[in-house]
């Protein structure tokens, strides 16, 4: 297993609709044709998997149907979007990239993107 550098933004603020997007960029040592991307959430020193997708280079990322993630790839960049976020989902979201093919196997883990989610204030009752 060889190490690989993965870059991602330090901080992202989710939209009022609970959507956060960030770019995960990896320094591929060669031309990888099968890549696995995983988003992990670290909060209170606990790590959980948020979503994962394996894609063949040139094809779209395919997450499971019930995944809260969507994404697109372009070269060595993956544009990730996480939906349905609430304030309690605030945490460090780590991008992990694995180059499965061709060999050798490479693993890269980013430093994480701190995603802040602020629940919108409820609209005040209106007399109109």
């Amino acid at each position: 297993c060889k190490a690989m550098h993965v870059a991602q933004p330090a901080v992202v603020l989710a939209s009022s609709r609970g959507i956060a997007s960030f770019v995960c960029e990896y320094a591929s040592p060669g031309k990888a044709t099968e890549v696995r991307v995983t988003v992990l959430r670290q909060a209170d020193s606990q790590v959980t998997e948020v979503c994962a997708a394996t894609y063949m280079m040139g094809n779209e990322l395919t997450f499971l149907d019930d995944s809260i993630c969507t994404g697109t790839s372009s070269g060595n960049q993956v544009n990730l979007t996480i939906q349905g976020l609430r304030a309690m989902d605030t945490g460090l979201y780590i991008c992990k990239v694995e180059l499965m093919y061709p060999p050798p196997y490479y693993l890269g883990i980013g430093n994480g993107t701190q995603i802040y989610v602020i629940d919108p204030e409820p609209c005040p009752d209106s007399d109109f």
Epitope: C1, T33, L40, M56, M100, Y101, I109
Partner: nanobody, 119 residues
């Protein structure tokens, strides 16, 4: 605990076939690059064949066209179909799983199964 259990080894004559199987823990199989390595007496362990989760395969030149690696994700099992066996294929064959789980990388090997090709 992750376990890789190989089976299917044995003694065969040159030109015959064998199929090796390796059953893996469900928790890692579908996300692992699965491979077969072999080690002959007095030699270094060498990669024979590998298969990715997406089904991409690689073979060492000496087995190309004779060996076929495949995986059954429903059974968490990887296979090595070995045809036209030669005496130089004699070795202990090891199943390998490589990948990462959460933030930890892993590189597991099974106990090995002996393949002997002799007349």
């Amino acid at each position: 605990e992750v376990q890789l259990v190989e089976s299917g080894g044995g003694l065969v004559q040159p030109g015959e076939s064998l199929r090796l199987s390796c059953a893996a823990s469900k928790s890692i199989f579908s996300i692992s690059v699965m491979a077969w390595y072999r080690q002959a007496p007095g030699k270094q362990r060498e990669l024979v064949a590998r298969i990715t989760p997406g089904g991409n395969t690689n073979y060492v030149d000496s087995v190309q066209g004779r060996f076929t690696i495949s995986r059954d994700n429903a059974k968490n099992t990887v296979y090595l179909q070995m045809n036209s066996l030669k005496p130089e294929d004699t070795a202990v064959y090891y199943c390998n799983a490589q990948g990462s789980l959460l933030l930890a990388k892993y590189d597991y090997y099974g106990q090995g199964t002996q393949v002997t090709v002799s007349s």
